[in-house]
Amino acid sequence: MNGRVDYLVTEEEINLTRGPSGLGFNIVGGTDQQYVSNDSGIYVSRIKENGAAALDGRLQEGDKILSVNGQDLKNLLHQDAVDLFRNAGYAVSLRVQHRLQVQNGPIGHRGEGDPSG
């Protein structure tokens, strides 16, 4: 029997200081470019080596960015989201959602010959 894949979803506030080439990550998504089916949210597609996000270490590729400096990223066109990041200032606060994949073992009862814990 196959294991079930579950996801552990957590949220985190990440504060980054803009570097010479921005905050150090790329984004995809938006109402006009859905990255995840039926979800127009903004996602991190790449963390740039030695950029602000990589040096901080908390933001991960695949994270969903919920807000920038308190401004919600729901229902934004892709370019509007890009513009928010471009104009966010020197010190930037991101609310992000991490989605960690958790692989559970096969579901079923223990066999008679199995060791009992």
């Epitope: 790329n26 597609s45 990041f85």
Partner: nanobody, 126 residues
Amino acid sequence: DVQLVESGGGLVQPGGSLRLSCAASGFTLDDYAIGWFRQAPGKEREGVSCISSHGSTYYADSVKGRFTISRDNVKNTLYLQMNSLKPEDTALYYCAASYYSDYEVAVCRSDALDAWGQGTQVTVSS
């Protein structure tokens, strides 16, 4: 300091070919969505071809089948191979990168890019 420097432009006859180069310094090219843009005298700037950090490509309808974008990550250089050139391809060609967008179509259609080169002139004339 982030810098993009284009080269490879010139005068070519209709039907001819050119290969433009865009050398990047101060950042790693394959971390960015980046593309080629052109502006002819009296016309608006046009996104010609763009490539995402993951290698997805976009081409304007006017150049599909004739132009090819590519990237050499070792040389940290972006290329545009231009074949079957037409007089209407005459323009100043720039490369430009987005610090945030990783969507090649959006980058090519954007007026809000973060790093620009100075451009290289391409003239197609007999």
